[in-house]
């Protein structure tokens, strides 16, 4: 039975040109995390494999950095980066847990005036 839960940073916003850390945390389970996939819609951004380490998709190499931890850092943000991001935890023996983060990238002037998502 899958008892774990994924905690994420929820809905977040960031300035165009800036950077943001996407973080998920798996709790309430003793399952072993074998791999974490980071995806944007259906596009694979990066994989962190417990044995084989980090691998960043070639198309994101210039703008994505591994970490901290199992998280992912997105750099040089553009408005096109706005959207849903998923952390997919592959675990043994539980199976797969998925967390969702919604990122909105704002024009600098909008961000400076304090437009922010409320984290539920």
């Amino acid at each position: 039975m899958m008892t774990g839960t994924i905690e994420t940073t929820g809905n977040i916003s960031a300035e165009k040109g800036g950077s943001i850390i996407l973080q998920c945390h798996l709790s309430s389970t003793t399952a072993q995390v074998t791999q974490v996939n980071w995806e944007q819609q259906d596009q694979l951004l990066a994989i962190c494999n417990a044995d084989l380490g980090w691998h960043i998709s070639p198309s994101f190499k210039d703008r994505v950095a591994p970490g901290p931890g199992l998280g992912l850092t997105l750099q040089s943000l553009t408005v096109n980066d706005t959207g849903e991001y998923f952390c997919i935890y592959h675990t043994y023996p539980d199976g797969t847990y998925t967390g969702r983060i919604f990122l909105e990238v704002l024009e600098s002037s909008v961000a400076e005036h304090g437009a922010r998502f409320q984290i539920p």
Epitope: T34, Q35, I47, N49, D51, P58, T96
Partner: nanobody, 117 residues
Framework: EVQLVESGGGLVQAGGSLRLSCAAS????????MGWFRQAPGKERELVST????????YYADSVKGRFTISADNAKNTVYLQMNSLKPEDTAVYYC??????????WGQGTQVTVSS
């Protein structure tokens, strides 16, 4: 399922070279990385080197940098580990591994490398 078969191990004198091969078969379409690990008697398994499926990204453990080179022939579904300037401390069983997007790792049976002084 992905099947991995290693070859190329053997006995070599210190300073010599060996080239390990790892032939992959089966459902390799989902593989995003392949790599080599080694395990010496009484020691923990150590990641030696990895290469991404597109060959664009490689990793080397500090202990083998400048001596070992990983490469891939995608047409043959084979990954190679060229090992030069071998040292007695490189003696170990070398295992090939493949990582898949679905979070499953596959392992070969291993090939023995012995470096004599």
């Amino acid at each position: 399922e992905v099947q991995l078969v290693e070859s190329g191990g053997g006995l070599v004198q210190a300073g010599g070279s060996l080239r390990l091969s790892c032939a992959a078969s089966g459902s390799t379409f989902d593989t995003y990385v392949m790599g080599w690990f080694r395990q010496a008697p009484g020691k923990e398994r150590e990641l030696v080197s990895t290469i991404s499926s597109d060959g664009d990204s490689t990793y080397y453990a500090d202990s083998v940098k400048g001596r070992f080179t990983i490469s891939a022939d995608n047409a043959k579904n084979t990954v190679y580990l060229q090992m030069n300037s071998l040292k007695p401390e490189d003696t170990a069983v070398y295992y090939c591994a493949a990582g898949t997007r679905r979070g499953r790792n596959y392992w070969g049976q291993g090939t023995q490398v012995t470096v004599s002084s």
